[in-house]
Amino acid sequence: AGVFELQIHSFGPGPGPGAPRSPCSARLPCRLFFRVCLKPGLSEEAAESPCALGAALSARGPVYTEQPGAPAPDLPLPDGLLQVPFRDAWPGTFSFIIETWREELGDQIGGPAWSLLARVAGRRRLAAGGPWARDIQRAGAWELRFSYRARCEPPAVGTACTRLCRPRSAPSRCGPGLRPCAPLEDECEAPLVCRAGCSPEHGFCEQPGECRCLEGWTGPLCTVPVSTSSCLSPRGPSSATTGCLVPGPGPCDGNPCANGGSCSETPRSFECTCPRGFYGLRCEVSGVTCADGPCFNGGLCVGGADPDSAYICHCPPGFQGSNCEKRVDRCSLQPCRNGGLCLDLGHALRCRCRAGFAGPRCEHDLDDCAGRACANGGTCVEGGGAHRCSCALGFGGRDCRERADPCAARPCAHGGRCYAHFSGLVCACAPGYMGARCEFPVHPDGASALPAAPPGLRPGDPQRYL
């Protein structure tokens, strides 16, 4: 367990020409606040997946009124850190989204209005317990400067907050195989051993010997999936024996999403999916027009010239969502043919073709037989990016240049002797057998299991295989 901490240093116009207009004015004073969303791993997802590591909202900053004629300065910021607690191990690699929101404090009917000023995102590697990392991100003409760190909550220590520390039992040294806990040299690393048999997938422990279950699992070893169907009472505690989890009040109870947004539970909270024309944490931001630039990732804003007409974002291929905020795996459309490998480069799709295929989508089958000759009357057969020769009788090898030994595979059954012949092979059958490969027994009364032998051949005579 631990806490991710974010310190915003400044938010204001970036360097270079074209400073942005101040977001506030004498007529419309406003104040800023920030939202941070964290996800584990080096996820490419921009805005759509839940903030699986957690999210936090800052306090509101001081009220700011633009000085007429002055360029937009760095805007006044909220006090304090944004803190995102994490319950489990710190993943080491994470993705972040930091949003800067403007709260307008004019005489809006129905309270203040919110609008998204800027959104920055990135992927970073970070060890828990390390120093503050400084960062600068730009969103359009705005620049955000911030620092961040991850720290473990005692008794957890280590770069992933997975090791536990305990006060020393003996004054001089730690127990066998246990190291001192830097920087707490007076404490010792504690072996974190969960209860024997505790499910590694569905259970975890914060104290040695315990087994705590992740959501959706129950039982002493967290091996029993939760079933809500066999529960009788509408509310109540979980039963470890039946595996029945009776839900308590859920984060979506009472639907916290405004303006017709739909609520879905996340491991730590809830997430609102907003109807077109609304966004924000609870779909509370409305009155958005195309002039507010609501379409992300190159989306084109259509309609929405005034607050009463809803805008639509036409999203470039590869993005979806009402604001083009969701990345789509374009390779899932399997654009590369003939087993080509798909690469989504963001601005373009590329196919890496298997041998024998070419073209932007590997749609061209190269002529594998072009310039290839099969010797000794063999014919070339194309396939899978490589040519193959179908050889005439008596020849073999890749290009039919090798003389084949037709007897090498011991084709004559029941002890028949094989002789190579210019037109194939001949089997001399052992007594009692006949057929091209000596495969048929001759009946004791002299009748064959086959129709009568062709004229001029007695059973037992060599049968030539043509």
């Epitope: 003409a141 084109l300 259509v302 470039p316």
Partner: antibody
């Protein structure tokens, strides 16, 4: 690399329908938005409209009442129809591919001059 | 709709000189969704810059774009003989997609 090839008549009579077709090669038509742009002789560029294989369309408000764009994924083609043409519709007509990263144009055809005259 | 005004209409310069072309929007072009194109006589336009400042594939680094909000600039640091053409800006923030009227860069 995506390549585009335009086809259609170079001369259309007033009040008739201007029809042009653009054939896409070197890429699937389902991976891009496709657009039509025109340029009257000696003048600037004017966007006409675009289409996506899924059926999404968007047109310039000034032409919306007269224009339609369709797509035939099986032939890797998209087409422009502009009805009730007048001499003011005389222009070089370009078909183009819209970028994967935004609604700007990174694949262009050479262009076809369509003259509206009786 | 967003109206894009390009200035100057014509720019007369010599090879080796620096060219600065302006594109001004009637309202803010959000997220710097602005592109620049070059068009030579008898040819289709060619994409130079997107996102106000990102060079398209194969575009020489003497071409650069800058700006945000309502004011955007295309700069050609040192004009080459093949650079003389008409240049258009285009916004792709709000429908309808619109182009500027163009700036002709001609040899002095």
């Amino acid at each position: 690399q995506v390549h585009l090839q335009e086809s259609g008549p170079g001369l259309v009579k007033p009040s008739e329908t201007l029809s042009l077709t653009c054939t896409v090669s070197g890429g699937s038509i389902s991976h891009y938005y496709w657009t039509w742009i025109r340029q009257p002789p000696g003048k600037g560029l004017e966007w006409i409209g675009y289409i996506y294989y899924s059926g999404i369309t968007n047109f310039s408000p000034s032409l919306k009442s007269r224009v339609s764009i369709s797509v035939d994924s099986s032939k890797n083609q998209f087409s422009l129809n502009l009805n009730s043409v007048t001499a003011a519709d005389t222009a070089v007509y370009y078909c183009a591919g819209i970028s994967l990263a935004g609604f700007y144009f990174d694949y262009w055809v050479q262009g076809t001059l369509v003259t509206v005259s009786s | 709709e967003i109206v894009l005004t390009q200035s100057p209409g014509t720019l007369s310069l010599s090879p080796g000189e620096r060219a600065t072309l302006s594109c001004r929007a009637s309202q803010s072009v959000s997220r710097s969704y602005l592109a620049w194109y070059q068009q030579k006589p008898g040819q289709a336009p060619r994409l130079l810059i997107y996102g106000a400042s990102s060079r398209a594939t194969g575009v020489p680094d003497r071409f650069s774009g800058s700006g945000s909000g309502t004011d955007f600039t295309l700069t050609i640091s040192r004009l080459e003989p093949e650079d003389f053409a008409v240049f258009y800006c285009q916004q792709y923030s709000i429908s309808p997609l619109t182009f500027g009227g163009g700036t002709k860069v001609e040899i002095k």
